[in-house]
């Protein structure tokens, strides 16, 4: 399987909510002993490999934000911990895997990485990540709502999390 980032850049005004999304596509094994570990973390654009450095999102580590579920299941973080920090990660039946961040501040700007791992009965088999940039802006130059710029050279889209 592969991980695609629907948008490579999100530009949002301060105070807005945003949902960053990765999509898992390609052949996905849905055997009874296959599960998926999915998580989010912040990183920096390394010279060698993007997403190799791990930093917390609003003080929550990749382990705090992870989901672990069967290949055919949907899941989301119901942890009070994440919600207290204005965060929620979720995964649906269609391969979409997202993190929603509420009440954005300038400190939320940076590179975000999603990680998807296929686990076959206790063994980590396949690890793939995706990366995207979040820019939080303030002042007169800030957009009125979040604008997402596709990974390919398509038109930008206005997107705002509910």
């Amino acid at each position: 399987f592969k991980v695609a980032t629907l948008y490579s850049l999100y530009v949002c005004p301060e105070g807005q909510n945003v949902t960053l999304t990765c999509r898992v596509f390609g052949p996905v094994d849905k055997g009874h002993d296959v599960t998926f570990y999915k998580t989010w973390y912040r990183s920096s654009r390394g010279e060698v490999q993007t997403c190799s450095e791990r930093r917390p999102i609003r003080n929550l580590t990749f382990q705090d934000l992870h989901l672990h579920h069967g290949g055919h299941q949907a899941a989301n973080t119901s942890h009070d911990l994440a919600q207290r920090h204005g965060l929620e990660s979720a995964s649906d039946h269609h391969g979409n895997f997202s993190i929603t961040m509420r009440n954005l501040t300038l400190l939320d700007s940076g590179l975000y990485c999603c990680l998807v791992v296929e686990i076959r009965h206790h063994h980590s088999e396949h690890r793939v990540h995706g990366a995207m940039e979040l820019q939080v802006q303030t002042g007169k130059d800030a957009p009125s709502s979040c604008v997402a710029y596709p990974s390919s050279s398509q038109e930008s889209e206005n997107i705002t999390a509910a």
Epitope: Y37, T39, F62, Q63, H68, V117, I119, H122, H123, S124
Partner: antibody
Framework: QVQLQQSGAELMKPGASVKISCKAT????????IEWVKQRPGHGLEWIGE????????NYNEKFKGKATFTADTSSNTAYMQLSSLTSEDSAVYYC??????????????WGQGTLVTVSA | QIVLSQSPAILSASPGEKVTMTCRAS?????MHWYQQRPGSSPKPWIY???NLASGVPARFSGSGSGTSYSLTISRVEAEDAATYYC?????????FGGGTKLEIK
């Protein structure tokens, strides 16, 4: 926080059976494998087998088939291991451990305190 | 069954020394886990996937290796490191542990 609380020490007669319990708290018990591990002095750690509480699926180390039987009660978040036809070779500390998937790597993430089983005539 | 052989069985070191213990597998593995067991206590997860420290593990610990050869190194041993260290594979049933390396502090 995740905790595994095991039942107390047992002194058993040869030929008897013993049932050890492992009560889990702090996580979704049904979704993660419970592992059972044997430790005899000077023998290190030996994997006995595992049970997935939600489905009741089990996997055994061939060496312990017929010796150990795993069950789980999701209503009480408790896993059990029964050891039958006890001999002195079964005298050991038995641990339950819960699978944790950390950074996408499963391992024995949480351990009970151990249950000492002594088999003596 | 994959056999994990640890050496040395006993390692004696003075505080501040660098020590390395090894774990050899009878078949090639993608990665190795390590656990620490102090006397009278349950094992604790210590190093996952060959080289990643579990939460709370001091940075003086490190892990490395690939294929059939893996090692755990402590850059400067401290008294609290006195314990037995076990390697473990979760690649094939039966899942196995090494025989352990007991670290003694002089």
């Amino acid at each position: 926080q995740v905790q595994l609380q095991q039942s107390g020490a047992e002194l058993m007669k040869p030929g008897a059976s013993v049932k050890i319990s492992c009560k889990a708290t702090g996580y979704t018990f049904s979704r993660y494998w419970i592992e059972w591990v044997k430790q005899r002095p000077g023998h290190g750690l030996e994997w006995i087998g595992e049970i997935l509480p939600g489905s009741g699926s089990t996997n055994y180390n061939e060496k312990f088939k017929g010796k150990a039987t795993f069950t789980a009660d999701t209503s009480s978040n408790t896993a059990y291991m029964q050891l039958s036809s006890l001999t002195s070779e079964d005298s050991a500390v038995y641990y339950c451990a819960s699978e944790e998937v950390y950074d996408g790597y499963p391992w024995f993430g949480y351990w009970g305190q151990g249950t000492l089983v002594t088999v003596s005539a | 069954q994959i056999v994990l052989s640890q050496s040395p069985a006993i390692l004696s070191a003075s505080p501040g020394e660098k020590v390395t213990m090894t774990c050899r597998a009878s078949s090639s593995l993608s990665y190795m886990h390590w656990y620490q067991q102090r006397p009278g206590s349950s094992p604790k997860p210590w190093i996952y996937a060959t080289s990643n420290l579990a939460s709370g593990v001091p940075a003086r610990f490190s892990g490395s290796g690939s294929g059939t050869s893996y090692s755990l190194t402590i850059s400067r041993v401290e008294a609290e490191d006195a314990a037995t260290y076990y390697c473990q594979q979760w690649s094939s049933n039966p899942y196995t542990f090494g025989g352990g390396t007991k670290l003694e502090i002089k």
